[in-house]
């Protein structure tokens, strides 16, 4: 009854209250969850179902093609990143249901909530790699003919994963379990030992490397790609544009609330009303960011249907056509079918 793994009575309704009715008996039953937490739970449930099934299907489709198709390598890695993040969802879901009580211990606290950040960095770095690949296919076709191969693609993915792990370390290191005396609750969160400068530094690095810099570089990158594609009168350029916008936008739209609240909280005092309000929205922001983990398969399916009219084809068959179509490099006038042309754009997964 006295270890971290015990179920505490719930006194959540005493949070934030300084004036209490002295005659009211202590209610040890579970009180209702806040609206943001309920919304977060709904999103987590949907993301888990769609994310696990969708990404498992993408992994299954691309794994067989990864030896010979470079696009399959990209999508396989993105799907693995998303799938891994989805595995943490049942634990995060359970914690929210228990009013953020964390009965899973210190190791789980360090690892599981860090998975979404690993996903963010892995996805954005893989996206950068894929975008570079797209850029080279359009602007350096001869180089691609000579050097672009599966081996190099796997090396690039390994580098992306390595960097992602490196960038996730601060979150991993500063995550701790804190057992609060009243109301009795074990919480899992980041603790910078009241070092606001360190907290701000981590938040700024996360914002810049995980959001602002990719937003700038990818916008420039795809602007050039699309301009070149249009100038070559690519047959499906408008559809391509829609897919590229959907893919790139999904990452930045769904990460925006998390990044904004994160940077704000790092500059606010923990006892300030704004901080406390943002903290109540934290689960919702995390769940919103988690949508990235299930959006890719949806985009692939929609893109496959839109481009190929394959509504009557089986889902694996449709995905195979979208995800494993190899890029064609044509002599001096390069024109790529897979990439700028097909859905190969979901370079941006998280």
């Amino acid at each position: 009854m006295d270890s971290f793994n015990y179920t505490t009575p719930d006194y959540g309704h005493y949070d934030d209250k300084d004036t209490l009715d002295l005659n009211t008996p202590v209610d040890k039953t579970s009180n209702t969850l806040r609206v943001p937490d309920i919304l977060a739970l709904v999103i987590f449930a949907v993301v888990f179902l769609v994310g696990v099934l969708g990404n498992a299907l993408v992994v299954w489709v691309t794994a067989f093609e990864a030896k010979r198709t470079i696009n399959a390598i990209w999508f396989l890695n993105l799907a693995v990143a998303d799938f891994l993040s989805c595995l943490a969802l049942p634990i995060l879901f359970t914690s929210i249901v228990q009013h953020h009580h964390w009965p899973f211990g210190g190791a789980a606290c360090s690892i599981l909530p860090s998975l979404i950040l690993l996903n963010m960095y892995a996805s954005i770095l893989l996206l950068a790699t894929i975008s570079a690949d797209r850029f080279l296919l359009v602007f350096k076709p001869i180089w691609c003919q000579n050097f672009r191969g599966a081996g190099l693609a796997w090396i690039a993915c390994a580098v992306a994963w390595g960097l992602a792990l490196l960038l996730t370390i601060p979150s991993f290191l500063y995550r701790v379990v804190r057992e609060e005396y009243f109301p009795p609750k074990v919480l899992c969160g980041v603790d910078y030992s009241h070092d606001k400068r360190r907290e701000r530094a981590v938040a700024i690095v996360r914002l810049v490397l995980g959001f602002l810099w990719p937003l700038l570089t990818l916008t420039i990158c795809y602007t050039f790609i699309l301009l070149r594609t249009w100038s070559r009168r690519a047959t499906r350029s408008t559809k391509t544009l829609k897919v590229v916008v959907a893919v790139v936008a999904s990452f930045f739209i769904f990460w925006l609330p998390y990044q904004v609240t994160g940077i704000m909280m790092s500059f606010l005092e923990p006892s300030s009303p704004t901080f406390l309000l943002l903290k109540k929205l934290d689960s919702l922001c995390v769940s919103f960011a988690y949508i990235n983990c299930c959006i890719n398969p949806i985009i692939y399916v929609v893109a496959g249907q839109g481009f190929q009219g394959r509504l009557r084809k089986s889902l694996p068959s449709l995905l195979r056509n979208v995800l494993t179509e190899e890029s064609v490099v044509r002599e001096s006038k390069s024109f790529t079918r897979s990439t700028v042309d097909t859905m190969a754009q979901k370079t941006q997964a998280v």
Epitope: T24, Y181, K185, P270, F275
Partner: antibody, heavy 121, light 112 residues
Framework: QVQLQQSGPELVKPGASVKISCKAS????????MNWVKQRPGKGLEWIGR????????KYNGKFKGKATLTADKSSSTAYMQLSSLTSEDSAVYFC??????????????WGQGTTLTVSS | DVVMTQSPLSLPVSLGNQASISCRSS???????????LHWYLQKPGQSPKLLIY???NRFSGVPDRFSGSGSGTDFSLKISRVEAEDLGVYFC?????????FGAGTKLELK
């Protein structure tokens, strides 16, 4: 008014056990946590643990697990702490102290007068 | 465990003068609900501790207004504006934000 009346001083032999009592009055015993605190000269105050008399729910300081056992009797509004396998290190003054759950104070506010335990052969 | 470090350990004062005691915690004492559960107690020889200040700056019932508490996060202080004879004793800071509850080593307020 709030009162926490503790049992008298104890002189016990090493290896033995002892049970200290703390009788509460002047407030709703079941709407509180009863905390136990150890004080040794030059060692400051150490929190042993707490009990919720309403249902016997306990929480211990890791340092005192296996050493202290907390119980409570709602009918007599009395909290108990049993200390086992006593050594000279257990010689100290032991306080019971309440934490009222329904309160604006949210602190350990009232303390018993203390029970002196001497472990000696 | 949260380590509470008090200074000074001994504070000689003259009656009527101001006294100030500092308390620093090894971790932030801000609770998830925004409150900071840092308290101050006075223990006189042969007696049990008495609550003076709760939640950093709130005076407990019956505590004179010459006692005041301040601070945030990890740094806190207790001030006695004009020390009286009845104020002499050992002052402890304590936190009830996290388990286990922990106490400072104490500051002995004594006459010069």
């Amino acid at each position: 008014q709030v009162q926490l009346q503790q049992s008298g001083p104890e002189l016990v032999k090493p290896g033995a056990s002892v049970k200290i009592s703390c009788k509460a009055s002047g407030y709703a015993f079941s709407n509180s946590w009863m905390n136990w605190v150890k004080q040794r000269p030059g060692k400051g105050l150490e929190w042993i643990g707490r009990i919720y008399p309403g249902d016997g729910d306990t929480k211990y300081n890791g340092k005192f697990k296996g050493k202290a056992t907390l119980t409570a009797d709602k009918s007599s509004s009395t909290a108990y702490m049993q200390l086992s396998s006593l050594t000279s290190e257990d010689s100290a003054v032991y306080f019971c102290a309440r934490f009222l759950l329904i309160s604006t104070v949210t602190a350990v506010d009232y303390w018993g007068q203390g029970t002196t335990l001497t472990v000696s052969s | 465990d949260v380590v509470m470090t008090q200074s000074p350990l001994s504070l000689p004062v003259s009656l009527g003068n101001q006294a100030s005691i500092s308390c620093r915690s090894s971790q932030s004492l801000v609770h998830s609900n925004g409150n900071t559960y840092l308290h101050w107690y006075l223990q006189k020889p042969g007696q049990s501790p008495k609550l003076l200040i709760y939640k950093v700056s709130n005076r407990f019932s019956g505590v004179p207004d010459r006692f005041s508490g301040s601070g945030s996060g990890t740094d806190f202080s207790l001030k006695i504006s004009r020390v009286e004879a009845e104020d002499l004793g050992v002052y402890f800071c304590s936190q009830s934000t996290l388990v286990p509850l922990t106490f400072g080593a104490g500051t002995k307020l004594e006459l010069k």
